[in-house]
């Protein structure tokens, strides 16, 4: 049986909140990595200005069994307007490079970082 | 082909709580998010929400948080909103509508009228 | 909570051309935001006409067409029909939640 009662529904989190546990769950990522991350996964390079959180997603949730990335690809979900399914490439337009899962979390680190500290939540 | 089908107009009292139905049909409910959108007499439209169907994921506009519940059967690929404690600015047409990215938007519900009046 | 603004009326003559902008409080509108402009006529539904930014949904004629100019979202309406007098929505998305412009009448006259 499952109790849908009795909570009230906490407020929807501001973007300036949903892009900061975004970037803290990167740092997170980074500062733990050990082992090559997501066993050296290699995915697609995205272009950090053009729609980039359903194309990081995109490229993303291509990895599969990485439990380091599971939260970071379910808050992504959260943050692009459509569905996005493995295999999906509508916001990847240009597909012509692979990176390591590693490389990519710190390319999408530093340009989240940079969009946080000019103000820039939208 | 693609159809949304939602439930007859209302007409209630302030403090009720309205339930509207949205079922699908010809494409796999569970592919896409739905989205529900207010639009008041003669006024612009208001994003309320969306849901993944597959999961039950939503997102709220702060606006309608505390009193809007999106939900979704898979089992009757139907779609639903409650909105409560409704006031007479609810009174509106309520929209359900497909959102993907190569047609976000791209189907609605024959929207839905709902009169809240003493 | 952002406030996404566009011009309350635009006039067009027939066959001309007119810009209508979607304006983010918040500061520059970017690909991000995955910019969505809308068509609506009396007694009906939304019409989708641009999504993305700048990609024209199935079936919208080439005359439309979306950008980002100086910061803002624009639709841009190049050789006017008659069939074009409606009110237009954009819908701006705000990394978990959208937001509808206030809208544009355009009047073909």
């Known amino acids: 049986l499952t109790c849908l009662g009795g909570f009230a529904s906490p407020g929807p989190v501001p973007p300036s909140t949903a892009l900061r546990e975004l970037i803290e769950e990167l740092v997170n990522i980074t500062q733990n990595q050990k082992a090559p991350l997501c066993n050296g996964s290699m995915v697609w390079s995205i272009n950090l200005t053009a729609g980039m959180y359903c194309a990081a997603l995109e490229s993303l949730i291509n990895v599969s069994g990485c439990s380091a990335i599971e939260k970071t690809q379910r808050m992504l979900s959260g943050f692009c307007p459509h569905k996005v399914s493995a295999g999906q490439f509508s916001s990847l337009h240009v597909r012509d490079t692979k990176i390591e899962v590693a490389q990519f979390v710190k390319d999408l680190l530093l340009h989240l970082k940079k969009l946080f500290r000019e103000g820039q939540f939208n | 082909e693609v159809q949304l089908v939602q439930s007859g107009a209302e007409v209630l009292k302030p403090g009720a709580t309205v339930l509207i139905s949205c079922k699908v049909s010809g494409y796999t409910f569970t592919d896409y998010y739905m989205h529900w959108v207010q639009q008041a007499p003669g006024k612009g439209l208001e994003w309320m929400g969306r849901i993944d169907p597959e999961d039950g994921e939503t997102k709220y506009a702060p606006k309608f948080h505390d009193r809007v519940t999106i939900t979704a059967d898979t089992s009757t690929d139907t779609a639903y909103m409650e909105l409560s404690s409704l006031r007479s600015e609810d009174t509106a047409v309520y929209y359900c509508t497909r959102y993907d990215y190569y047609g976000p938007f791209a189907y609605w519900g024959q929207g839905t009228l709902v009169t809240v009046s003493s | 909570q952002a406030v996404v603004t566009q011009e309350p009326s635009l006039t067009v003559s027939p066959g001309g051309t007119v810009t209508l902008t979607c304006r983010s409080s918040t500061g520059a509108v970017t690909t991000s935001n995955y910019a969505n402009w809308f068509q609506q006529k009396p007694g009906q539904a939304p019409r989708t006409l641009i999504y993305g930014t700048n990609n024209r949904a199935p079936g919208v004629p080439a005359r439309f067409s979306g950008s980002l100019l100086g910061g803002k979202a624009a639709l841009t309406l190049s050789g006017a029909q008659p069939e074009d007098e409606a009110e237009y929505y954009c819908?701006?998305?705000?990394?978990?939640?959208?937001?509808f412009g206030t809208g544009t009448k355009v009047t073909v006259l």
């Open positions: 819908a701006l998305w705000y990394i978990n939640h959208f937001i």
